[in-house]
Interface confidence: low
């Protein structure tokens, strides 16, 4: 009997140690699981943490590239722009410079024409005085007549060199204003991206008219809004009109006027005085003149370019102006010896 | 001892059972262990792949902030270079007008003069004759009111015809200058951010103009829709150089150039003389002259303001370049008024 | 004078579709970007939509709260701005605004419709 | 989205006063895409202020605007009984555009 329990309880011992190595290994599986799953969980968040911020870089680098995009947009609009300007201003003053040197000949014209026509005036008096002269002293015996013969001649003279001083007069001032209401005739018309309502008259520009003449309310852009559209750009009246140059001669060099881009905006819209029309303008997309540009912000960007390729070679357009710069200032120097 | 080798024969079975369920756990807990390690390596394989890629983005998002800074630097040195260009083409512009004018007033002083030579020459030779003619008369007694009456024409013609050069002096240059201001004055009209009522100040800047001659309203907003930039704006000397503007009102360039709005996108919208709609223009996405942008607001408008960081406003260069060219108008305007 | 008119509101009920309009009227439409941008009762401004211009093929851009569900369209000829909602839900009720705009502004606004969704 | 973050949330003032509102973005904006607008009960929003600082038409010299980077403020010189509104900032710099939630003047 002793024997028995004696085996017993070793059985039981053996048992309880089972139990015991049991759930310790369920506890040593359980902590090591807890263990894996913290250490996950940390991983994980990890993971996520990352690609959030993979997700933000990767929105930011887009938007970037967008405006870097846009950017560079504008940047060769600029170059357009300007190469665009220096074209128009080199042609308006070179528009200038050709008028002043018409404005020179016509004055020497004029005052050869002013010298001949006082010698003329001159010369005849001469030939009238002495035949009256002649005829005076022969017939002493009737003075009246002869009186009003010398008379004739003295009224005749004047009035003869005043339709000469006149037809000076008057055509003086007309090549000059019709100098300028040509140039401005010339302006092309510009289209602006809107359907364009009026103008497409011919009158458009012009200057100064004859009494009572209404003047045509313009309906172009003063220069392709710049960045846009390409197409879009018209002169600025402001030197075209500035210049009051004579363009009949159309064949104008260098850029069509079509060409002369100007500064992005400036559409003009004109009205003729007695309307009193609440014109108003409203920043269209269109208004940019502009090719593909939208300003509109991040939000329109569409640019999203991946490259940081700054493809633009910004600085060839400081060349461009540099060659239009020296061109203009030999036109001026050339202008100022006149 | 049948009983003893039953329990010891138990516990025999136990501790084998012991040792199967040990052996059985360290097995469940390597494989457990392995099955994390695999997991764990691919979590930290994750975490390393987004890390690199991390990395890579951040590199390309420093290289494209620095290239889009870079960019920007280009922009407003284009604006600057812009300004710049416009300004000293205007100024040349201006000399060209100026010399012009000094040409055609130099013209009418020689004409003048020439005339007037002519006409002195005219009048001492009739006095002389008359002179000469009165001494052989009376020689020949011959009575002295005849004399008068043969006289007095001759002494009427130089004045006749001074008139007449009079005339022709004074009226030849001004259709002339007429010319060049008027068309100034047809500098296209710009559009100011806002909603512009056209034609605020009709008389604004209006020169003479004949009788009946309808004015253009012009209704140009002040300063155009710059790039806003940087100061760069502000006022081109160029025109106002152009102009010879008086700038005895100092105040005009300046704090006002924070208004000089301009809308972005500056649509020209012009409507025949006649109508009387209330058109107006809204800053539209093409209003951004720039190829990706909108100036299609209120927004787009830039003011040709010289600070307001707005100089990073790429999208907007154009409205600099386009306010640069309403202040060159508005001055030339001033100027022509002056 | 700018005018922008909006029309087209009214109840309808959960999942339902409705269409609004706008008339534009004093400025150039067919070179304007539009956009839509609603009030919720209580609530502020929410940007909803906005299309651009011929130019820019009519380009289209939504908030993440409406899309797929909202498509916002344009009638150049008519200078007539639309929005077809569908699917729409209760959070959609508000008034609706007509505006013009551009880089990321909005210019000018109509006087709204109101547009309420509820069973 | 860029979020944008208007305090204080009401605020009231009375006539004469110098009032000024704020607006945080979540992260930088340009200048240039940031705008105030008014809303009065009873009538549509109205733009106040556009890039930044800039006046838009028929805005009375008394508001202004400035700021940069994430802080952003409008600022009425001396307030006026008709300011009474709620005021909203806005960023046109990415879609989606987003509006602060409105300050509210209201008069003391």
């Known amino acids: 009997e002793l024997k028995k329990n004696e085996f017993q309880g070793e059985l039981e011992k053996q048992r309880e140690q089972l139990d015991k190595i049991q759930s310790s290994h369920n506890f040593q599986l359980e902590s090591v699981n807890k263990l894996y799953q913290d250490e996950k969980a940390v991983l994980v968040n990890n993971i996520t943490t990352g690609e959030r911020l993979i997700r933000v870089l990767q929105d930011q680098l887009k938007t970037l590239q967008r405006n870097y995009g846009r950017l560079q947009q504008d940047v060769l609009q600029f170059q357009k722009n300007q190469t665009n300007l220096e074209r128009k201003f080199s042609y308006d003053l070179s528009q200038c410079i050709n008028q002043m040197k018409e404005v020179k000949e016509q004055c020497e014209e004029r005052i050869e024409e002013v010298t001949k026509k006082g010698n003329e005036a001159v010369a005849s008096r001469d030939l009238s005085e002495n035949n009256d002269q002649r005829q005076q002293l022969q017939a002493l015996s009737e003075p009246q007549p002869r009186l009003q013969a010398a008379g004739l001649p003295h009224t005749e003279v004047p009035q003869g060199k005043g339709n000469v001083l006149g037809n000076s007069k008057s055509q003086t001032p007309a090549p000059s204003s019709e100098v300028v209401l040509d140039s401005k005739r010339q302006v092309e018309k510009e289209e602006t991206n809107e359907i364009q309502v009026v103008n497409e008259e011919p009158q458009r520009d012009r200057l100064p008219q004859e009494p009572g003449r209404e003047q045509v309310v313009e309906d172009r852009p003063v220069g392709g809004r710049g960045f846009g559209g390409a197409g879009e750009l018209g002169q600025t009246p402001q030197v075209q009109a500035a210049l009051s140059v004579s363009q009949e001669n159309p064949e104008m060099e260098g850029p069509e006027r079509d060409q002369l881009v100007i500064p992005d905006g400036q559409e003009e819209e004109q009205e003729a005085a007695g309307e009193g029309r609440n014109q108003q303008k409203l920043r269209g997309e269109d208004d940019y003149n502009m090719d593909e540009n939208e300003a509109e912000s991040e939000t329109d960007k569409q640019a999203a370019l991946a490259g940081n390729d700054r493809n633009i070679d910004v600085f060839n357009v400081e060349d461009q102006k540099r060659d239009t710069i020296n061109l203009l200032d030999q036109r001026e120097k050339r202008n100022h010896t006149l | 001892e049948l009983k003893k080798n039953e329990f010891q024969g138990e516990l025999e079975k136990q501790r084998e059972q012991l040792d199967k369920i040990q052996s059985s756990h360290n097995f469940q807990l390597e494989s457990v262990n392995k099955l994390y390690q695999d997991e764990k390596a691919v979590l930290v394989n994750n975490i390393t792949t987004g890390e690199r890629l991390i990395r890579v983005l951040q590199d390309q998002l420093k290289t494209l902030q620095r290239n889009y800074g870079r960019l920007q630097q280009d922009v407003l040195q284009f604006q600057k270079n812009q300004t710049n260009l416009e300004r000293k083409f205007s100024y040349d512009l201006s000399q060209c007008i100026n010399q012009m004018k000094e040409v055609k007033e130099q013209c009418e002083e020689r004409i003048e003069e020439v005339t007037k030579k002519g006409n002195e020459a005219v009048a001492s030779r009739d006095l002389s004759e008359n002179n000469d003619q009165r001494q052989q008369l009376q020689a020949l007694s011959e009575p002295q009111p005849r004399l008068q009456a043969a006289g007095l024409p001759h002494t009427e013609v130089p004045q006749g015809k001074g008139n007449v050069l009079g005339n022709s002096k004074s009226q030849t240059p001004a259709p002339s200058s007429e010319v060049v201001l008027d068309s100034k004055r047809q500098v296209e009209k710009e559009e100011t951010n806002e909603i512009q009522v056209v034609n605020e100040e009709p008389q604004r800047d209006r020169l003479p103009q004949e009788p009946g001659r309808e004015q253009v309203v012009e209704d140009r907003p002040v300063g155009g829709r710059g790039f806003g930039g940087a100061g760069e704006l502000g006022q081109t000397p160029q025109v106002q150089a152009a102009l010879s503007v008086s700038q005895e009102n100092p105040e005009m360039e300046g704090p006002e150039r924070d208004q000089l709005v301009i809308p972005d996108g500056q649509e020209e919208e012009q409507e025949a003389a006649g109508e009387g709609r209330n058109q107006q223009k809204l800053r539209g996405e093409d209003d951004y002259n720039m190829d990706e942008n909108e100036a299609e607001s209120e927004t787009d408008k830039q003011a040709a303001l010289a600070g307001n960081d707005r100089n990073i406003d790429v999208f907007n260069v154009e409205d600099q370049k386009r306010d640069t060219i309403n202040l060159l108008d508005q001055r030339e305007k001033r100027n022509h008024t002056l | 004078e700018v005018q922008l008119v909006e029309t087209g509101g009214g109840l309808v009920q959960p999942k339902g579709s409705l269409k609004l309009s706008c008339a534009a009227s004093g400025f150039t439409f067919n070179t304007n970007a539009m956009n839509w941008v609603r009030q919720a009762p209580g609530k502020g401004l929410e940007w909803v939509a906005r299309?651009?211009?011929?130019?820019?093929?009519?380009?289209?851009f939504y908030a993440d709260s409406v899309k797929d569900r909202f498509t916002i369209s344009r009638d150049d000829s008519q200078s007539m701005l639309f929005l077809q909602m569908n699917n729409l839900k209760t959070e959609d009720t508000a008034m609706y605004y007509c505006?013009?705009?551009?880089?990321?502004?909005?210019?000018?606004w109509g006087q709204g419709t109101t547009l309420t969704v509820s069973s | 989205e860029i979020v944008l973050t208007q305090s204080p949330t009401t605020m009231p003032a009375s006539p004469g006063e110098k009032v000024t509102f704020t607006c945080s973005a979540s992260s930088g904006i340009s200048s240039n895409y940031l705008h105030w607008y008014q809303l009065k009960p009873g009538f549509s929003p109205k733009l106040l202020i556009y890039r930044t600082s800039n006046l838009a038409s028929g805005v009375p010299a008394r508001f202004s605007g400035g700021g940069s980077g994430t802080s952003y403020s409008l600022t009425i010189g001396t307030m006026e009984a008709e300011d009474v509104a709620t005021y909203y900032c806005?960023?046109?710099?990415?879609?989606?555009?987003?509006f602060g939630a409105g300050t509210k003047l209201e008069l003391k």
């Open positions: 505006v013009t705009g551009g880089t990321g502004t909005f210019d000018y």
């Open positions: 806005q960023q046109g710099f990415s879609i989606p555009l987003t």
């Open positions: 299309i651009r211009t011929k130019r820019y093929n009519y380009t289209t």
